[in-house]
């Protein structure tokens, strides 16, 4: 038997993936556990094996179909269960009625690229990945730029309150190495959260022209 408190948190990427983390205070002795997804209106059901991510938490990804296929809508509710093997049978450790479009976390933006760079500014674009067409333009972004001698945590957040897949960074220092990241969030969903940050994009501003003011 397992004692202690349990936390079971899942997010839908808006297309064909539900990612779950299960935390359990009590120790599990080499027990095999899985997440089972059972939608209330659809024909599929899916299972994934929970794998340890720390001493007391496990994670897995429910792959519902091809990455860009739309497997759930706003009308769906998915019963999610954590099942752990106890001898010859499975025991339900946690359960939730999961409303996918109330619990969104999109994939990190991809394909970051420098469109144009100057001495003091840089124009960067990106793409969103595996995001549902249901959102239309109802997305927002946050971006941050890593300057020399600073940490990501110190970087000020730039907020784009609309679906704008580019940014023009201003007031940069000439001939300086920077890194840039962006993340995305739908406006929909009570428990929706930001996507992970994108992979950092490194870029360097152009040197100032010799003999000219900078």
């Amino acid at each position: 038997a397992v004692n202690g408190t349990s936390q079971f948190t899942c997010f839908y990427n808006s297309r064909a993936n539900i990612s779950c983390v299960w935390s359990q205070d009590g120790a599990l002795q080499d027990t095999s556990c899985q997440v089972h997804a059972w939608p209330d209106r659809r024909r599929w059901n899916q299972t994934c094996e929970l794998l340890p991510v720390s001493q007391a938490s496990w994670a897995c990804n429910l792959i519902l179909g091809a990455p860009d296929s739309q497997k759930l809508t706003t009308v769906d509710i998915v019963t999610l269960r954590v099942l752990c093997r106890e001898g010859v049978r499975w025991r339900v450790m946690a359960i939730q009625d999961f409303k996918p479009f109330e619990n969104l976390r999109l994939m990190a933006p991809i394909s970051l690229q420098v469109v144009h760079v100057e001495t003091h500014r840089c124009n960067i674009s990106w793409e969103i990945s595996q995001a549902s067409h249901y959102f239309e333009r109802h997305l927002e972004f946050e971006a941050r730029t890593l300057s020399p001698g600073h940490t990501w945590e110190e970087a000020p957040l730039l907020t784009l309150k609309q679906k704008q897949e580019w940014i023009c960074l201003e007031t940069l220092t000439p001939d300086t190495q920077y890194e840039f990241q962006v993340r995305v969030k739908p406006l929909q969903g009570e428990f929706t959260t930001w996507s992970p940050w994108s992979q950092p994009l490194a870029f360097r501003t152009k040197p100032a022209a010799l003999g000219k003011d900078t």
Epitope: D40, R41, R42, R43, S69, Q70, T73, V75, H133, Y134
Partner: antibody, heavy 116, light 107 residues
Amino acid sequence: QVQLVQSGAEVKKPGASVKVSCKASGYTFTSHWISWVRQAPGQGLEWMGDIYPGSGNTNYNEKLQGRVTMTVDTSTSTAYMELRSLRSDDTAVYYCARERGGFDYWGQGTLVTVSS
Amino acid sequence: DIQMTQSPSSLSASVGDRVTITCRASQDISNFLNWYQQKPGKAPKLLIYYTSGLHSGVPSRFSGSGSGTDFTLTISSLQPEDFATYYCQQDNNHPYTFGQGTKLEIK
């Protein structure tokens, strides 16, 4: 095998109410939504709403202007659809259907005639 | 509400013909599109779910395709029992809506 068996035909006067039943068998009643769909004579299909027997949660078509109520009795695996303030254009065959990626099983239909 | 428009409204064909019925949604419904067959005095029967999934017991001559707003039901070789009315239906969002129907008649 899965079966949905509906109550018999009804004749009602305008302004009255009707309650149609749908008894399910052959599957776990509480695990699938039940929808109600109607079809006026010689016309197409109109979705009225649905109910989840496991929770009693409902969704209604706003076109019915609050005149419809769907309920279940899990002890008898029966779904009910009540339509109030009946009008002549409510004359139709009323179907219950189980939802599972489409309406995969249907009742035989209940003819409700509204006539003065 | 999402409007579903079928074409044609009626169609005459012969046994052995290949027949195509189309359904257009007024907005993107991804693949949440089902097809039904109905014969006079009977309840509809599910043929195809989620655009292309063949419901159990349905002959393989029935197939579905499409995505977004445009969908197709194809009967590869008409049989005598296929003469009926066909409806598309979206289960992308409430209220669920049906096409107006396509009546398939014997030529």
